[in-house]
């Protein structure tokens, strides 16, 4: 054989996204001799590996290798042979991986090795796995709607490369759902970011940008499920919780041990006498966001302005992308349409809590019941965590764009993520030739 | 012409130690994943293990038979591979070759002519 | 770990003849099997790489077929040097396995 041929014209990239809820893979492609441009790398593939997210192999660390060999083969398929000992693969842990890790940082270190050791079997050039930091959650999924809405490029266009694309080049502020946090990122208009722990300053292709970022660990969809149910088991009478998170007719056992497994039910635990309690859905979206509410400290606020917690938060600026679950809830539901106002999502969300159960498995027969079941609390959740929380309103609903894919690459902090670690956002505006490295960020 | 070419085999008792060397040419030998394939007496082939990049951190990975107890290591500016051999046993005497592939990977097209490794008492 | 199972153990033929060796992976590992032909006293030689590819400076004679758990290594005509032992390799996953051989002999 002769030596290796001269690299494809192309090149690769895969970034696993370790969430709490599961993993996802992501394989990105880019024209090598472009890769300092803008808007040039996609999204070839997502791989969602089968299982739950890596957090819950803390008791069997020996099935990680086993479950992560579907998606590495499929990427093996997809990325060309005389690639693959090139293409970099890094593996992003999230809140679920934080979570285990304020229980145990021995037991998180553990899952992360096994993980290690199980992706560099592969011939691919790992680059490593990291529980990633719930601002670098926020900046990188920032990052990457900008990048794919063109708001980086220097070049202003006519015309529009996706429906919610204004012209101008203001970024997208970002909102992010995940399993166990969120994270809200945008940049303020002529505010001072008066918490320096939520500030942030890039500097991507010539141009400063000053952006605030938060991420609530905790605050994710099935971490605040917990909390409301630690919350509303407290004042129980019984073993019996009657919810109106949940649709009428809908039951469930729930085991008190499981409840409290969870560091984000801590303030909440007591001394129950009983071991397992069941929900019983009564289905009334107004109860249910009353009850989500008690979940946001909204009396204490060392700032100008807070979102809850005593977290600062500027006044709201510009349009937002929402991705991951906010998208996928409110796809569910059907209401991502730029149409559909607040309250007429209010409107809507008050009559499918209020759909018995039996109705509901009929009408989404092919749906999972685990999910099925928490579509009600979820989207009112979202709801009082947009509204309430980061204080939209119903005149500025409509600058929230939900989004799944942009340019057909998901909305999400895995492309953000690939791109500053393979140093592919240049500080400065590219010339005709690439600059050196030590100009990215 | 690429070449390969072991050293550092001979006699040695159970539980001794010995270190192969492997010097490369006719390569960009820093490019390379490297490894090392044994064969003993009148016997099969065995994978002993490879070394990876520098953009790798040198990642390492052996064969279950030899892990805990042999080191591959690299040093890029000699061209040189290197088989640290500790607590051996009988059944590690076989030939030794160092191996690589210049296309693709996980495959040999180069093989040295091997060094000879006698473990006995 | 991938086994790798070689038949016949030997197999003996006359030159001019075609000769078939097999090679069976205990699981599926796409087209990720090597050949290689060893003589007495020298190193392993790579014949055949991905089931079926072909190397320059290898006679056309030689070839490969298979995917998945089944292999085999063609010599349509055998000339008097191709008497040597044969060794398919799994470079799938991790750890490579070889299999057994098939020596192939003179009748």
């Known amino acids: 054989t002769q030596n290796k041929a001269l690299p494809e014209n192309v090149k690769y990239g895969i970034v696993l996204d370790a969430g709490s809820s599961h993993t996802s893979l992501y394989i990105y492609k880019w024209p090598a001799e472009k890769e300092n441009d803008t808007g040039v790398v996609h999204q070839v593939e997502e791989c969602r590996v089968k299982g739950p997210g890596i957090s819950k192999f803390v008791q069997k660390v020996n099935e990680i290798g086993i479950y992560l060999t579907d998606c590495m083969e499929r990427a093996r398929e997809v990325i060309p042979r005389s690639q693959h000992q090139e293409t970099p693969v890094y593996l992003g842990a999230t809140a679920g991986m934080r979570l285990l890790r304020m229980e145990s940082e021995e037991l998180a270190d553990r899952v992360l090795d096994v993980v290690e050791r199980s992706l560099s079997n592969y011939p691919f050039d790992f680059q490593g796995a990291r529980i990633i930091t719930g601002q670098e959650e926020g900046a990188y999924g920032w990052i990457t709607i900008n990048y794919l809405l063109g708001k980086f490029s220097q070049k202003t266009r006519w015309f529009s490369i996706v429906p919610y694309e204004t012209n101008n080049q203001e970024t997208f502020g970002a909102l992010d759902l995940g399993g166990a946090s969120t994270q809200v990122t945008f940049v303020p208009q002529n505010q001072t970011i008066e918490s320096p722990d939520n500030a942030l300053q890039f500097r991507l292709y010539g141009k400063d940008y000053n952006v605030y970022t938060h991420s609530f660990l905790c605050y994710g969809k099935d971490q605040a499920l917990w909390q409301k149910l630690a919350k509303d088991i407290q004042v129980a009478s019984n073993e019996i919780l009657r919810d109106p998170c949940f649709h009428p007719g809908y039951k469930k056992v729930v085991n008190v041990s499981d409840l409290y497994k969870t560091p984000c039910t801590k303030r909440f635990e007591m001394t129950l006498p009983f071991q397992q309690f069941e929900i019983q859905g009564i289905g009334n979206y107004q109860q249910c966001h009353q009850s989500i509410l008690e979940l946001f400290n909204t009396s204490y606020c060392p700032y100008s302005q807070c979102a809850f917690n005593g977290i600062f938060l500027p006044p709201l600026q510009g349009d937002f992308g929402a991705f991951s679950a906010f998208y996928f809830v409110m796809k569910f539901l059907n209401l991502t349409s730029e149409k559909v106002s607040q309250e007429k999502v209010t409107e809507m969300m008050k009559k499918f809590c209020a759909q018995p159960w039996e109705e509901i498995k009929t009408s989404y027969a092919g749906v999972k019941e685990k999910y099925l079941s928490e579509y009600c609390f979820s989207g009112t959740y979202i709801l009082s965590l947009l509204l309430q929380g980061y204080h939209f309103t119903a005149d500025s609903w409509e600058h929230i764009h939900f989004i799944g894919k942009i340019q057909g690459s998901d909305a999400g902090w895995t492309l953000g993520y690939m791109l500053n670690l393979t140093n592919m956002i240049p500080a400065e505006q590219p010339l005709s030739t690439p600059l050196s490295h030590s100009t990215y960020v | 012409e690429v070449q390969l070419v072991e050293s550092g085999g001979g006699l040695v008792k159970p539980g001794g130690s010995l270190r192969l060397s492997c010097a490369a040419s006719g390569f960009t030998f820093s490019k390379y994943w490297m490894n090392w394939v044994r064969q003993s007496p009148g016997k099969g082939l065995e994978w002993v293990g490879e070394?990876?990049?520098?953009?790798?951190?040198?990642?390492?990975h052996y064969a279950e038979s030899v892990k805990g107890r042999f080191t591959i290591s690299r040093d890029d500016s000699k061209n040189t591979l290197y088989l640290q051999m500790n607590s051996l046993k009988t059944e590690d005497t076989a030939v030794y070759y160092c191996?690589?592939?210049?296309?693709?990977?996980?495959?040999?097209?180069?093989w040295g002519q091997g060094t000879t490794v006698t473990v006995s008492s | 770990e991938i086994v790798l199972t070689q038949s016949p153990a030997t197999l003996s033929l006359s030159p001019g003849e075609r000769a078939t060796l097999s090679c069976r992976a205990s699981q599926s590992i796409s087209d990720y099997l090597h050949w290689y032909q060893q003589k007495p006293g020298q190193s392993p030689r790579l014949l055949i790489y991905?089931?079926?590819q072909s190397i320059s400076g290898i006679p056309a004679r030689f070839s490969g077929s298979g995917s998945g758990t089944d292999f085999t290594l063609t010599i349509s005509s055998l000339e008097p040097e191709d008497f040597a032992v044969y060794f398919c390799q799994n470079g799938h996953s991790l750890p490579l396995t070889f299999g057994g051989g098939t020596k192939l002999e003179i009748k």
């Open positions: 191996t690589t592939q210049l296309d693709l990977y996980w495959f040999f097209d180069v």
């Open positions: 991905y089931a079926s």
């Open positions: 070394i990876r990049l520098k953009s790798n951190k040198y990642g390492t």
